[in-house]
Amino acid sequence: PGPPAGSPRVSSDPRADLDSAVLLTRSLLADTRQLAAQMRDKFPADGDHNLDSLPTLAMSAGTLGSLQLPGVLTRLRVDLMSYFRHVQWLRRAAGPSLKTLEPELGALQARLERLLRRLQLLMSRLALPQAAPDQPAVPLGPPASAWGSIRAAHAILGGLHLTLDWAVRGLLLLKTRL
């Protein structure tokens, strides 16, 4: 090894990564909200729709104050990976009725991937435990019908909206702790 020499700064640091994650999450939340509204306009939902393979909501108002950095980032990454796979599945399995939303679903998937990359980079830089990416609990088979894929889309977008809403709050809170 040669004499001590400094390294140039890399493009970002963990705090900047967290800022970036917050911005990406907010942007994704707006996209999801808009897409969910489009879905409701085109295919009015008859009540709430659920999908067994979707993750349960990670946070609630009561737990927000006791959040820990590792737990939040790990859970958020696992949940978002599950939503990413569900959006992928929706794009593949969607019938003709959902094809009109293909550009929006494609953009949503790309933004989800960017957010997942950013969260992983943040976890690597902080040296937090890297969770094994979560496979959907239920193998995702083709929807039973065209209406089945519409109900699945309602459930996926609704769940993602709630997850991202809590993610923004959680990440903003974590910013004060890093």
Partner: antibody, heavy 114, light 111 residues
């Protein structure tokens, strides 16, 4: 400018101990995980140990588990590696690194020989 | 033997494009974990070259690019220059080992 400066290397007999230190400057050390990575003469890089930004998580390569201990003092911007029960195969240049790792020190040579 | 597999050597002439591969498994590269690339010039410490599969730190020329697909990743260097002669290492987190792993390194020779 970011700097990581290792110290504490040297010649030690098999079964002996050494403590490596790494002084960080030029960046917010307390926001980064800290690594030790080694490179035996003429060989490739081998990850040794990793500690989270706040010291709450520690990870070790199987080859050093139970013999090496990683620690950090964020108030001193310093990373440590306590090496016990040293073996000839631990002979290497030991690099301190931070982040992904994004930043690397220049390394300190540890020679284990009788 | 390294967990990530790289060719021991690669070569090219100035101006050429060379690619270095890095093959992993379902517990590292294939598990959605990011791949990072390092350059180690002779007699110096490693330097981060590519992070998060395809992002370049500031100061790294755009001649260097990374990509990832399935359980493999690759580093491409276009417009090869004599100063690119170095050892190149890939790295990724390995879930089964609970830690980062490095490839064995590829020695790049500029002919």
């Amino acid at each position: 400018e970011v700097q990581l400066l290792e110290s504490g290397g040297g010649l030690v007999q098999p079964g002996g101990s050494l403590r490596l230190s790494c002084a960080a400057s030029g960046f917010t050390f307390s926001s980064y995980g800290g690594h030790w990575v080694r490179q035996a003469p003429g060989k490739g890089l081998e990850w040794v140990a990793l500690i989270s930004y706040d010291g709450s998580y520690k990870y070790y390569a199987d080859s050093v588990k139970g013999r090496f201990t990683i620690s950090r003092d964020n108030s001193k911007n310093t990373l440590y590696l306590q090496m016990n029960s040293l073996r000839a195969e631990d002979t290497a240049v030991y690099y301190c690194a931070a982040g992904v790792p994004d930043y690397w020190g220049q390394g300190t040579l540890v020679t284990v020989s009788s | 033997q390294s967990v990530l597999t790289q060719p021991p050597s690669a070569s090219g002439t100035p101006g050429q494009r060379v690619t270095i591969s890095c093959s992993g498994s379902s517990s590292n590269i294939g598990s959605d974990y990011d791949v990072h690339w390092y350059q180690q010039l002779p007699g110096t410490a490693p330097k981060l070259l590519i992070y998060s599969n395809n992002e370049r730190p500031s100061g790294v020329p755009d001649r260097f690019s990374g990509s990832k697909s399935g359980t493999s990743a690759s580093l491409a260097i276009s417009g090869l220059r004599s100063e690119d002669e170095a050892d190149y290492y890939c790295a990724a987190w390995d879930f089964s080992l609970s830690g980062p792993v490095f490839g064995g390194g590829t020695k790049l020779t500029v002919l």
